[in-house]
């Protein structure tokens, strides 16, 4: 039960996290005009990964896409790449984890296969979360560097007569959304990995039962289950017996009452 709860919670947390990563990637407010200690402008500038926007105090907002690929800073391209990789990995992870959920039964999928899938999705979520956190952090670092550079020459005078307002940018809402979402995806991934350990069938001690058949004797070997938690392993777990007799422990295990929550 605890395993199912952990897996389910991990899935939900990761789902929220990935939705957040997608939202952050699409948001326009990665960097916003710094209003502190600045002249009160009637224009508010903010920028995203894909376009920059200007909101006038009149209420009119104009956004322009970055229609160039080569002309963009390498750091921005890197952030885009990290966020997209995070989304793709997260989406695949979600797909895999849906089939890995203990509360969903697909055909005669064994627990070991579900354990593998849970681990796979968990690792994908962890990497997805790390990609998002890395992307947002790289962008934040870029902002901090640019902020102090523009603060150094806040006003550039032309012969000391004319002043130019230097637009400084600070952290936008998307950065915080990205950090939180990345963290949630990471936590969800860790929960999935923890759930995987519980899903993996432990070595079960079966009662040694023997009977005499004509001509030769067969004994059940205790510990007939061999757990397979190898990443991507396709090994089938079979009970090792040779004969028709069954112990009470060996009654077919699916569908069990524990498979439905």
């Amino acid at each position: 039960m605890a395993v199912t709860a952990c897996q389910g919670l991990g899935f939900v947390v990761s789902l929220i996290g990935i939705a957040g990563i997608i939202a952050a990637t699409c948001m326009d407010q990665w960097s916003t005009q710094d209003l502190y200690n600045n002249p009160v402008t009637a224009v508010f500038n903010y920028q995203g990964l894909w376009r920059s926007c200007v909101r006038e105090s009149s209420g009119f907002t104009e956004c322009r896409g970055y229609f160039t690929l080569l002309g963009l800073p390498a750091m921005l391209q890197a952030v885009r790449a990290l966020m997209i990789v995070g989304i793709v990995l997260g989406a695949i992870g979600l797909l895999v984890s849906i089939f890995a959920l203990k509360c969903i039964r697909i055909g005669s999928m064994e627990d070991s296969a579900k354990a593998n899938m849970t681990l796979t999705s968990g690792i994908m979520f962890i990497v997805s979360g790390l990609c998002a956190i890395a992307g947002v952090s790289v962008f934040a670092n870029m902002l901090v560097t640019n902020f102090w550079m523009s603060t150094a020459n806040m006003y550039t005078g032309m012969g000391g007569m004319v002043q130019t307002v230097q637009t400084r940018y600070t952290f936008g809402a998307a950065l915080f959304v990205g950090w939180v979402a990345g963290g949630l995806t990471l936590i969800g991934g860790v929960m999935m990995c923890i759930a995987c350990r519980g899903l993996a069938p432990e070595e079960t001690n079966y009662k040694a039962v023997s009977y005499h058949a004509s001509g030769h004797s067969v004994a059940y070997k205790p510990g007939g289950f061999k757990a397979s938690t190898g990443f991507g392993s396709n090994t089938k777990n079979k009970k090792i017996y040779d004969g028709g007799a069954r112990t009470e422990d060996e009654v077919q295990s699916y569908p069990s009452k524990h498979d439905y929550v």
Epitope: Q33, P39, V40, T41, A42, V43, N45, Q47, S52, C53, V54, E56, S57, S58, G59, F60, E62, R64, V162, Q163, T164, V165, T167
Partner: antibody
Framework: QVQLVESGGGLVKPGGSLRLSCAAS????????MSWIRQAPGKGLEWVAT????????YYLDSVKGRFTISRDNAKNSLYLQMNSLRAEDTAVYYC???????????WGQGTLVTVSS | DIVMTQSPGTLSLSPGERATLSCRSS????????????LTWYQQKPGQAPRLLIY???TRESGIPDRFSGSGSGTDFTLTISRLEPEDFAVYYC?????????FGQGTKLEIK
């Protein structure tokens, strides 16, 4: 068509109060930033105050800050300017205007005269 | 505060002539975010409310004749009336629409010679 009609002007003694109103029609008032601009007799234009969309921000000319208050009632499509502690230098024709692209005042009312005199 | 300086104070011309009105701001009105200059030109006739002519320094308001054109960037701006019509004789104001307070120039009076 767009119409802005100011009212509430008149003669008032120094230190007195007055409330100007601006009735708007012909456009989406609630999603428009609105401003008050004044013009002293024989002088140039002077911006007084602006209220942005959704009551988010209000901006004032330094000389009127603390004395004048801009407000709006979207249900009534009306803009107001509450003027307290009036001075002789506040004597002017007060115009209400809508802000459009480029924060430019694209539509203006006909103006209302405020005279501050003892 | 941004100081807007208009020149000349008065311009005397005849109908059909070309009018060039100048406006200078003490600070740049160019917004780096969209590369637009937040300068506006208005026309005011005696006893009337001002009328918007040009915004973003060079964009003509709808309904404004194409003889009116705006140019300039940063701190220096110009309003040009290519061929003066009798109805163009009025007072012209430029306005900073970039930084509060939204200051106006003192105006240029365009009169018939």
């Amino acid at each position: 068509q767009v119409q802005l009609v100011e009212s509430g002007g008149g003669l008032v003694k120094p230190g007195g109060s007055l409330r100007l109103s601006c009735a708007a029609s012909g456009f989406a008032f609630s999603s428009s930033a609105m401003s008050w601009i004044r013009q002293a007799p024989g002088k140039g234009l002077e911006w007084v105050a602006t209220m942005t969309v959704g009551y988010i921000y209000t901006y004032y000319l330094d000389s009127v800050k603390g004395r004048f208050t801009i407000s709006r009632d979207n249900a009534k499509n009306s803009l107001y300017l509450q003027m307290n502690s009036l001075r002789a230098e506040d004597t002017a024709v007060y115009y209400c205007a809508r802000q459009g692209y480029g924060n430019a005042m694209d539509y203006w009312g006909q103006g209302t005269l405020v005279t501050v005199s003892s | 505060d941004i100081v807007m300086t208009q020149s000349p104070g008065t311009l005397s011309l005849s109908p059909g002539e070309r009018a060039t009105l100048s406006c200078r701001s003490s600070q740049s009105l160019l917004n780096s975010g969209n590369q637009k200059n937040y300068l506006t030109w208005y026309q005011q006739k005696p006893g009337q409310a001002p009328r918007l002519l040009i915004y973003w320094a060079s964009t003509r308001e709808s309904g404004i004749p194409d003889r009116f054109s705006g140019s300039g960037s940063g701190t220096d701006f110009t309003l040009t009336i290519s061929r003066l019509e009798p109805e163009d004789f009025a007072v012209y104001y430029c306005q900073n629409n970039y930084i509060y307070p939204l200051t106006f120039g003192q105006g240029t009076k365009l009169e018939i010679k």
